[in-house]
């Protein structure tokens, strides 16, 4: 139960992170006009990974897209497939775990496959928090050098445009959404990687046993049932587990083939 | 068409208020900024403030701020300014402008303006 | 604030003839989000308001004549009346509407020779 859970939970934790880095991505406020010196102004600009904004105190707003791709700087790129790379790992991952939930049953797919299913997506929703959380601080980090950068009057725009001496940029929305967003993807792929340890059916070992039957000894070898010595019910045989917390049932239960959810 | 209507002129003692009226007309009120210029005899032009009909919002110049106080009337679509400690320095033609969409912050519709006269 | 310098103060032409008048701006008026210049021309003829003639340093408001031309970028803007005609004797202010306040220049008066 713990596991269907953990796992269920770590799903739809990383499903919402994944949601926000897309989101992050699509956003045009990565980069917001400082406005610590006039906190109203009349013309305010924005930025994001692919385009940027203007708005004016009318309420009009402008977006032109970078159309050129060789003149953006190497570190705008580098974010954009962090972002890109990040949305289809999580995308995959999403996939994935989709049909390794405990609670959704396909075929006759063994807790082993799922487990590893669980765990490969687990993998991919760690990679993706990474790939975001590393795109946003690549970019913040782009940003406070600027930032610092346009004091000393040395101006470069997001898409190779000559700055004004009063347009500085600071953190926008998108930075934070990023953050929390692959802090969530990551979060869901703990869960789902914690999950998948308690999926994976453990080897059933059993203590060695002697049995001193009136005429010969037999000794009961690891494996379950498996162990036949050809004799009529063994009333005394007992399975003793060196781990495991599951059932019987649970052990036994396998999805026969019209068993479809 | 689009029009703003101001009283022709107002005569004030020095040390009174006033409140000058803008009612718009010709188009959706709320939808646009309404700015306000102070102009004095033979003189230059002079931004005092701006106002957002929709939600009340106004931004002033500081030199006005503690002369002019701006507010709206949504169901008469009209703009009002209110100028208090009346002096003759604010003897002036007064006029609300639209800020026009789209046209960076330049305003496309201007009233014929209100002249305040300061006199005892 | 932005302080805006017209010149000149005043300008004396005939019928017909080409005129240019200067503003500078303290400040640059050009943005960098979409790099447009954020400066207006306006037109006010004795008795009347301000008319807009030019806003985002080049571009006419619906209109107006195409004799009227708008240029620079930056902090130095002209405006050019390529042949003056009578109904264009008035004071020619520019204003920034980049940053607040607003501010207007001290404008050129346009009279007949």
């Known amino acids: 139960m713990a596991v269907t859970a953990c796992q269920g939970l770590g799903f739809v934790v990383s499903l919402i992170g994944i949601a926000g880095i897309i989101a992050a991505t699509c956003m045009d406020q990565w980069s917001t006009q400082d406005l610590y010196n006039n906190p109203v102004t009349a013309v305010f600009n924005y930025q994001g990974l692919w385009r940027s904004c203007v708005r004016e105190s009318s309420g009009f707003t402008e977006c032109r897209g970078y159309f050129t791709l060789l003149g953006l700087p190497a570190m705008l790129q580098a974010v954009r497939a962090l972002m890109i790379v990040g949305i289809v790992l999580g995308a995959i991952g999403l996939l994935v775990s989709i049909f390794a939930l405990k609670c959704i049953r396909i075929g006759s797919m063994e807790d082993s496959a799922k487990a590893n299913m669980t765990l490969t997506s687990g993998i991919m929703f760690i990679v993706s928090g990474l790939c975001a959380i590393a795109g946003v601080s690549v970019f913040a980090n782009m940003l406070v050098t600027n930032f610092w950068m346009s004091t000393a009057n040395m101006y470069t725009g997001m898409g190779g445009m000559v700055q004004t001496v009063q347009t500085r940029y600071t953190f926008g929305a998108a930075l934070f959404v990023g953050w929390v967003a692959g802090g969530l993807t990551l979060i869901g792929g703990v869960m789902m990687c914690i999950a998948c340890r308690g999926l994976a059916p453990e080897e059933t070992n059993y203590k060695a046993v002697s049995y001193h039957a009136s005429g010969h000894s037999v000794a009961y070898k690891p494996g379950g049932f498996k162990a036949s010595t050809g004799f009529g019910s063994n009333t005394k045989n007992k399975k003793i587990y060196d781990g495991g917390a599951r059932t019987e049932d649970e052990v036994q239960s396998y999805p026969s083939k019209h068993d479809y959810v | 068409q689009v029009q703003l209507q101001q009283p022709g002129a107002e005569l004030v003692k020095p040390g009174a208020s006033v409140k000058l009226s803008c009612k718009a007309s010709g188009y959706t009120f709320t939808r646009y900024l309404m700015h306000w210029v102070k102009q004095r005899p033979g003189q230059g032009l002079e931004w005092i403030g701006e106002i957002n009909p929709s939600n009340g919002r106004t931004n002033y110049n500081e030199k006005f701020k503690s002369k002019a106080a701006l507010t709206v009337d949504k169901s008469s679509s009209t703009a009002y300014m209110q100028l208090s400690s009346l002096t003759s320095e604010d003897s002036a033609v007064y006029y609300c402008?639209?800020?026009?969409?789209?046209?960076?912050?330049?305003?496309?519709?201007w009233g014929q303006g209100t002249s305040v006269t300061v006199s005892s | 604030d932005i302080v805006m310098t017209q010149s000149p103060s005043s300008l004396s032409v005939s019928a017909g003839e080409k005129v240019t008048m200067s503003c500078k701006s303290s400040?640059?008026?050009?943005?960098?989000?979409?790099?447009?210049?954020?400066l207006a021309w306006y037109q006010q003829k004795p008795g009347q308001p301000p008319k807009l003639l030019i806003y985002g340093a080049s571009t006419r408001e619906s209109g107006v004549p195409d004799r009227f031309t708008g240029s620079g970028s930056g902090t130095d803007f002209t405006l050019t009346i390529s042949s003056v005609q009578a109904e264009d004797l008035a004071v020619y202010y520019c204003q920034n509407d980049h940053s607040y306040p607003l501010t207007f220049g001290a404008g050129t008066k346009l009279e007949l020779k």
């Open positions: 400040q640059s008026l050009l943005n960098s989000g979409n790099q447009k210049n954020y």
């Open positions: 402008a639209r800020l026009a969409y789209g046209y960076g912050n330049a305003v496309d519709y």
